[in-house]
């Protein structure tokens, strides 16, 4: 069954799944944060074999790879801002 | 057991140009998550960060190398190279392939391969 | 850049003492997602780095006991419960925050 639509209410999941999916079937994971008219974050995994599934993104396993992504988008250290001084 | 290993020139002249490879096994740059980074160490100093690549093609450098630094991987070979541009004499050191698992960076190491830069 | 200070820069301990080795970095190294990748690495001569400790505090696989890491922000320490023989050698801590990723200068752990 397709999991991801688009529906009136803008979300792109109907269901969503906290099978684990082993990471050499994953091929890419999207991170849609709430918004946009969906009240709720999404993660859409794109597999391998070419089937998208929605994950819980409560499921522990989602998390981690996640983590993988936040850590390598969060690499370049952040400028300082530095406020002038008024006399 | 994953294993990596390092192959080079051994021995290059000032300007010419270094390439690395990197071959390893038990592991897939074809998995979310996994990358291949490369680390030199001169004789008897410590180490540093030179480049590493991801499972999707994304690249880091060396902003102090960046111009002189190409990574790149072939990932049915289960290969990763660098190339260094322009060697000198500061280059001469043992150079090292690493994996990176998700978070761990550079969990697992090769035995290293030494360049000495000499004319 | 952020720059990896250890101290000392040598350690001479007794085998079966305690040993602790520290590290400072020029800026806070926790991301924003909240995430702090410190990592301790161990040298011994000849040989290429092994990995002992990821994310300031977390045993890798085959790890003993004895090597615990802790610190958060820009302070973190690895300590060494019970030196045995085969724990001489460097040891580099390491930040995977933000790229450039840098090494501290090394702490050699050395029998006195």
């Known amino acids: 069954v397709l999991e991801v639509y688009y529906t009136s209410l803008r979300c792109r999941c109907v269901q969503e799944s906290s099978v684990f999916i082993p990471r050499r079937f994953i091929d890419r994971i999207q991170i849609l944060p709430r918004g946009n008219g969906c009240p709720r974050k999404e993660i859409i995994v794109w597999k391998k074999n070419k089937s998208i599934v929605c994950v819980d993104p409560q499921a522990e396993w989602i998390q981690r790879m996640m983590e993988v992504l936040r850590k390598r988008s969060s690499s370049t250290l952040p400028v300082p801002v530095f406020k002038r001084k008024i006399p | 057991q994953v294993t990596l290993k390092e192959s080079g020139p051994g021995i290059l002249q000032p300007s010419q140009t270094l390439s690395l490879t990197c071959s390893f096994s038990e592991f897939s740059l074809s998995v979310f998550g996994m990358g291949v980074g490369w680390i030199r160490q001169p004789s008897g100093k410590g180490l540093e960060w030179l480049a590493h690549?991801?499972?999707?093609?994304?690249?880091y450098y060396n902003p102090a190398l960046k111009s002189r630094l190409t990574i790149s991987k072939d990932t049915s070979k289960n290969q990763v190279f660098l190339k260094i541009a322009n060697v000198d004499t500061a280059d001469t050191a043992t150079y090292f392939c690493?994996?990176?698992?998700?978070?761990?960076?550079?969990?697992?190491w090769g035995q290293g391969t030494t360049l000495t830069v000499s004319s | 850049d952020v720059l990896m200070t250890q101290t000392p820069l040598s350690l001479p301990v007794s085998l079966g003492t305690q040993a602790s080795i520290f590290c400072r970095s020029s800026h806070s190294i926790v991301q924003d997602n909240g995430n702090t990748y410190l990592q301790w690495y161990l040298q011994k001569p000849g040989q290429s780095p092994k990995l002992l400790i990821y994310?300031?505090?977390n045993r890798f696989s085959g790890v003993p006991d004895r090597f615990s890491g802790s610190g958060s922000g820009t302070d973190f320490t690895l300590k060494i419960s019970r030196v045995e023989a085969e724990d001489l050698g460097v040891y580099y801590c390491?930040?995977?925050?933000?790229?450039?990723?840098?090494f501290g200068g090394g702490t050699k752990l050395e029998i006195k």
């Open positions: 390491f930040q995977g925050s933000y790229v450039p990723y840098t």
């Open positions: 690549i991801w499972w999707d093609d994304e690249k």
């Open positions: 994310k300031v505090s």
């Open positions: 690493a994996r990176i698992d998700g978070y761990y960076d550079f969990d697992y």
